[in-house]
């Protein structure tokens, strides 16, 4: 099939001791090959500071996955979710405020 770029959604949730978990979800993409990673100040975080979900079918012939990392509360602006799919990339910042999210269709 033809390339379908991912929808990218960034959320954050409070955790203990002044840290928050930021999660980046990519969905509705095809083919299944994708790079999803967190960057701090423009540079990719090491693998051992991130958790990845499997790339799974979402039932529509497309795929979904996620990556998460824990960061200090108040440092959200230094982090971006970096997505690479079919030769295209996108950078997705962390929204301010826990009730907000960034939901963006990457063209």
């Amino acid at each position: 099939g033809s390339t379908v770029p991912p929808m990218v959604n960034v959320t954050c949730s409070e955790v203990s001791e002044g840290n928050i978990t930021v999660t980046c979800r990519a969905s509705s993409f095809y083919p299944r090959n994708i790079t999803l990673t967190w960057r701090q100040d423009g540079v990719s975080l090491s693998h051992n500071t991130q958790q990845w979900g499997d790339v799974l079918p979402d039932g529509n012939g497309t795929y979904q996955t996620w990556v998460a990392t824990r960061i200090r509360q108040g440092e959200e602006q230094r982090f971006t979710c970096y997505m690479e799919h079919s030769g295209n990339h996108g950078t997705h910042p962390v929204p301010s405020g826990n009730s907000h999210h960034h939901h963006h269709h990457h063209h």
Epitope: T35, D41, G42, Q77, R78, G87, N88, H89, T91
Partner: antibody, heavy 117, light 107 residues
Framework: EVQLVQSGAEVKKPGASVKVSCKAS????????IEWVRQAPGQGLEWIGA????????NYNEKFKDRATLTADKSTNTAYLELSSLRSEDTAVYFC??????????WGQGTLVTVSS | DIQMTQSPSSLSASVGDRVTITCRAS??????LAWYQQKPGKAPKLLIY???TLADGVPSRFSGSGSGTDFTLTISSLQPEDFATYYC?????????FGQGTKVEIK
């Protein structure tokens, strides 16, 4: 010291192509995205697109998607912008810049491209 | 695309004056806003990022504020070297867009 050094001024005829280079030094070239911006004479700034020098993956402004090609050569720490089918409105100074997370921290000195018959 | 509107487009001021430039986004960009200073024939120079963080080496007379859609750049006491054009830029989503610029001239 982080430095981005761009190629010299170019004069092109309408319909031609131009390739501008941006040589990076003073940091790990493949770790950071390189962005391209242009500025027409007396005008404001316009984002063209970005490239990941490590992978070659690109992100284009839809306005330039059909005519701009971004590439990078890891062996020489150099990023390139090629713009095809030039027209007079493409006369501008073209800048490269390093993307440091969520802003551009270092810029090249700019390359003037003049399109004239 | 998010449109960035700066005001005023130009202003005349004297050395020692307090100068305020505003930038309005057409949508919520959280705090993902940078300010640049540009002098004729030169590349833009980063002044402020994340709406209010001063870049390295930038004098403390420059300050930024705002979040969401409305942002301000203030020069507390204008110096001779501050006469230039100032641009805001949003980093919430691509295409990254700039304000049209504010030219600060000598009165």
């Amino acid at each position: 010291e982080v430095q981005l050094v761009q190629s010299g001024a170019e004069v092109k005829k309408p319909g031609a192509s131009v390739k501008v280079s941006c040589k990076a030094s003073g940091y790990a070239f493949t770790n950071y995205l390189i962005e391209w911006v242009r500025q027409a004479p007396g005008q404001g700034l316009e984002w063209i697109g970005a490239i990941n020098p490590g992978s070659g993956a690109t992100n284009y402004n839809e306005k330039f998607k059909d005519r701009a090609t971004l590439t990078a050569d890891k062996s020489t720490n150099t990023a390139y912008l090629e713009l095809s089918s030039l027209r007079s409105e493409d006369t501008a100074v073209y800048f490269c810049a390093r993307f440091l997370g969520n802003y551009f921290d270092n810029w090249g000195q700019g390359t003037l491209v003049t399109v004239s018959s | 695309d998010i449109q960035m509107t700066q005001s005023p487009s130009s202003l005349s001021a004297s050395v020692g004056d307090r100068v305020t430039i505003t930038c309005r986004a057409s949508g919520n960009i959280h705090s993902y806003l940078a300010w640049y200073q540009q002098k004729p024939g030169k590349a833009p120079k980063l002044l402020i990022y994340y709406a209010e963080t001063l870049a390295d080496g930038v004098p403390s007379r420059f300050s930024g504020s705002g979040s969401g859609t409305d942002f301000t750049l203030t020069i507390s006491s204008l110096q001779p070297e501050d006469f230039a054009t100032y641009y805001c830029q949003q980093f919430w989503t691509t295409p990254y867009t700039f304000g049209q610029g504010t030219k600060v001239e000598i009165k």
